[in-house]
């Protein structure tokens, strides 16, 4: 906490500029003018502030402004976003998807902080649902975002939203969140032809049910065995030999090395020995 | 990353001069800084002297400006600080920092990363 002192003469500022480096603390405290400093926010990034002095200008805004700072302050925080915690964001209410962009950048090449979880969950909070724009932007800069989120939170992403999702944003989820996710990556891409249709819902894959799986082994689609691996193992079991072998095409041989993992070994042990015959690969039921 | 190692403090009689060192590892680029700071017994640091080496432009503070003077050997990836003049109240502990402009990329945005030496005390004393 830096004292109350008067500014001495000659040394108010009057704007945000480079001549403020040589201000000690407490001269920052009392020659700069709070309401200056927020609306040339956007000079003090540019200006080589030490952190210590850093400290100071926030110290300024959180006087300011104690119900939380308005957006246009926000947009330009800059550095200053990594000094906040999470109880200075949730006083925040971040509508604008730049404003979003700006603080993530800032962030950028570091894992989810604390910071940016909190100011995440306001964001989505205040739009009411994960739409495709911010879905696009938080799996940009965060690609397990998607993954971090519970069932209950991915319940209110809209299925429009899931063009925006990449193969390696589900890398991480479980069955429960791909549970929720496959239903609606079906009904995004519903109208797709068969081959489009495959390499897009591949990924969610993992919380399909048997009888869209059954529908895809009609479809020629060559699925391949790290897909084939995570499906859930409930909707492997009920199907037949000759349904994984239309449904795995030429990849049907991976089963072999395969056979003593999860969903591979309990489907073979549901299958008659005469029907993996056929395959033959040499799988013991 | 970039380390800085300072050198050249030691004990001097008012009058005379000193040069300190700060040797940088790590790469130095043009949007970035180079300051030398100071923090005498009891008081807060304060910046004495500094480059922007995009626009090669020196910066002082009021106390001592003419008297000391701030250089760069690009060669060496070293930093100077030339004081002559000393006076008893320039004793210090003079640190040397860099202030690397860490850009985000996709706009012009950005701000500045520090990085600090461990200090080298001055002392001006008869």
């Known amino acids: 906490e830096v004292e109350k002192t008067a500014c001495p003469s000659g040394k108010k500022a009057r704007e945000i500029d480079e001549s403020l480096i040589f201000y000690k603390k407490w001269e920052l405290e009392a020659c700069v003018d709070a309401a200056l400093l927020a609306t040339q926010m956007d000079r003090v990034n540019a200006i080589p502030f030490t952190y210590e002095q850093l400290d100071v200008l926030k110290h300024k805004l959180d006087e300011l402004y104690p119900q939380g700072y308005p957006e246009s302050v926000i947009q330009h925080l800059g550095y200053l976003f990594l000094k906040m915690s999470p109880e200075d964001i949730r006083k925040w209410n971040v509508t604008s998807l730049e404003t979003l962009k700006a603080l993530l950048e800032v962030n950028k090449g570091h894992e989810m902080s604390p910071q940016v979880a909190t100011l995440i969950d306001r964001f989505v909070k205040g739009r009411g649902q994960l739409d495709k724009d911010t879905l696009d932007t938080l799996t940009a800069f965060y690609p397990g975002y998607l993954c971090s989120l519970s069932p209950e939170e991915l319940s209110s992403v809209p299925p429009s939203s899931i063009w925006a999702v990449r193969p390696q944003d589900l890398d991480t989820c479980d069955p429960r969140q791909l549970d929720v996710l496959y239903p609606k990556a079906r009904l995004a891409f519903q109208n797709m032809n068969g081959s489009e249709y495959f390499v897009k819902i591949q990924s969610f894959l993992g919380g399909a049910p048997t009888e869209d799986l059954k529908a895809l082994s009609q479809q020629n689609v060559s699925m391949d065995l790290a897909t084939f691996m995570k499906l859930r193992t409930d909707a492997v079991l009920p199907l037949t030999v000759a349904e994984v072998q239309k449904l795995l095409g030429p990849h049907v041989e991976g089963l072999k090395a395969e056979e003593r993992h999860r969903p591979v070994r309990d489907w073979i042990l549901r299958q008659r020995q005469d029907d993996l015959d056929t395959l033959g690969l040499g799988l013991q039921g | 990353q970039v380390q800085l190692v300072e050198s050249g403090g030691g004990v001097v009689q008012p009058g005379r001069s000193l040069r300190l060192s700060c040797a940088a590892s790590?790469?130095?680029?043009?949007?970035?800084?180079m300051h030398w700071f100071r923090q005498a017994p009891g008081k807060e640091r304060e910046l004495v002297a500094g480059i922007n080496i995009g626009t090669n432009t020196y910066y002082y503070a009021d106390s001592v400006k003419g008297r000391f003077t701030i250089s760069r050997d690009n060669s060496k990836n070293t930093l100077y600080l030339q004081m002559n003049s000393l006076r008893a109240e320039d004793t210090a502990v003079y640190y040397c920092a860099a202030f690397l402009w860490k850009s985000y990329g996709s706009s012009d945005g950005g701000y500045y990363l520090q990085y600090w030496g461990q200090g080298t005390l001055v002392t001006v004393s008869s």
């Open positions: 790590g790469s130095i680029f043009e949007s970035d800084r």
